[in-house]
Amino acid sequence: LIIGFGISGRHSITVTTVASAGNIGEDGILSCTFEPDIKLSDIVIQWLKEGVLGLVHEFKEGKDELSEQDEMFRGRTAVFADQVIVGNASLRLKNVQLTDAGTYKCYIITSKGKGNANLEYKTGAFSMPEVNVDYNASSETLRCEAPRWFPQPTVVWASQVDQGANFSEVSNTSFELNSENVTMKVVSVLYNVTINNTYSCMIENDIAKATGDIKVTESEIKRRSHLQLLNSKAS
């Protein structure tokens, strides 16, 4: 969490941002809140990015003002116009690109004063893994697949029964470049698995950590997946 205060001139207002990550090719949110004003027409929201000459986005007098927008962000940004009045200056970024990563500034002007806060935005690709029993294999084998990751993640297998065991000798992980030549499909195979055990396939890079669990018994197979974004710090 980053909390920024205003500078010179009028009184300062508090602006708060939260570091976040964007999944390339999908839409992302750059979070920013501020002390609200009673009049929408008095609120100016400006988003800037380090390394970019023009503005990322500008909202003033109750509407988007895009004449100063940098071409890099054209057609890809929007604020939540109906929530500005309650102090939400968050930016929706469409079709996140790898190059969108960097330092952003949320700059606010209201009748109470000015304030700003920086936000670190990471970009990459992350997806939920799915673990399945590979019935085609000669021995009991599990196959963990996740369709989109970037940068290249690490894959670690764990088991509930053999806690702390190192499965690197009995697993094989491959990374296959997807058609857009950035993200990769992750496939990891675990050999010599035993029945009545829960196995976890953990995929992690510096942006996200995802886990796919599978519990194999003689009568059923249970699966569970979850994904967690790393380093979500507020400013």
Partner: antibody, heavy 115, light 113 residues
């Protein structure tokens, strides 16, 4: 009301450098780009480059790359344009202009390059 | 870079008459998603910096008299002064702000006939 006030006229020798300043008042200095545009005598307008004062990010027209340096000092709301290796064809009026859409302009600074 | 070409280079029009200046861009400055043309017109009087008249190809800047109007889309644009006044004698420039580097037309000098 936004005002941009530039430094005074300069006479320079070929091969030397010139540094022109542009001080902003009456508005938010840091968030809009400050651009530099030059106009040779009797000629048109030519964009040289610009800077985002908040982050110090500068972009230059290819023609001036390596010869121009644009900087900004947030504390004094002042932008600077330095042009090096001056030649006679650099004799021009140099303007600072605020924003990608140049809504506000400085009064211009005449730089004369003569031996 | 986008090249902006204005025509004519100079123009003489009688007071009260219509003046028309054309501007052509080497590539489209229309962004289809928002249907906006990133094209502006400036007026420059002798010894003064340019003054923004029109942006988004047809939106008048605040304080600009309504005798000034802009039209066109894509690559072809026009600045029209419906009834020329003595104070309109100046050089007029079109500018694209669609991409960096920002580029200007070579200018059109408008005089009274």
């Amino acid at each position: 009301q936004v005002q941009l006030v530039q430094s005074g006229a300069e006479v320079k020798k070929p091969g030397s450098s010139v540094k022109v300043s542009c001080k902003a008042s009456g508005g938010t200095f840091s968030t809009y780009a400050i651009n530099w545009v030059r106009q040779a005598p009797g000629q048109g307008l030519e964009w040289m480059g610009g800077i985002n004062p908040m982050f110090g990010t500068a972009r230059y027209a290819q023609k001036f790359q390596g010869r121009v340096t644009i900087t900004a000092d947030e504390s004094t709301s002042t932008a600077y344009m330095e042009l090096s290796s001056l030649r006679s064809e650099d004799t021009a009026v140099y303007y600072c202009a605020r924003g990608r859409l140049h809504r506000h302009w400085g009064q211009g600074t005449l730089v004369t390059v003569s031996s | 870079d986008i090249v902006m070409t204005q025509s004519p280079d100079s123009l003489a029009v009688s007071l009260g008459e219509r003046a028309t200046i054309n501007c052509k861009s080497s590539q489209s400055v229309l962004y289809s998603s928002n249907n906006k043309n990133y094209l502006a017109w400036y007026q420059q009087k002798p010894g003064q910096p340019p003054k923004l008249l029109i942006y988004w190809a047809s939106t008048r800047e605040s304080g600009v008299p309504d005798r000034f109007s802009g039209s066109g889309s894509g690559t072809d644009f026009t600045l029209t002064i419906s009834s020329l006044q003595a104070e309109d004698v100046a050089v007029y420039y079109c500018q694209q702000y669609y991409t960096t580097p920002i580029t200007f037309g070579q200018g059109t000098r408008l005089e009274i006939k």
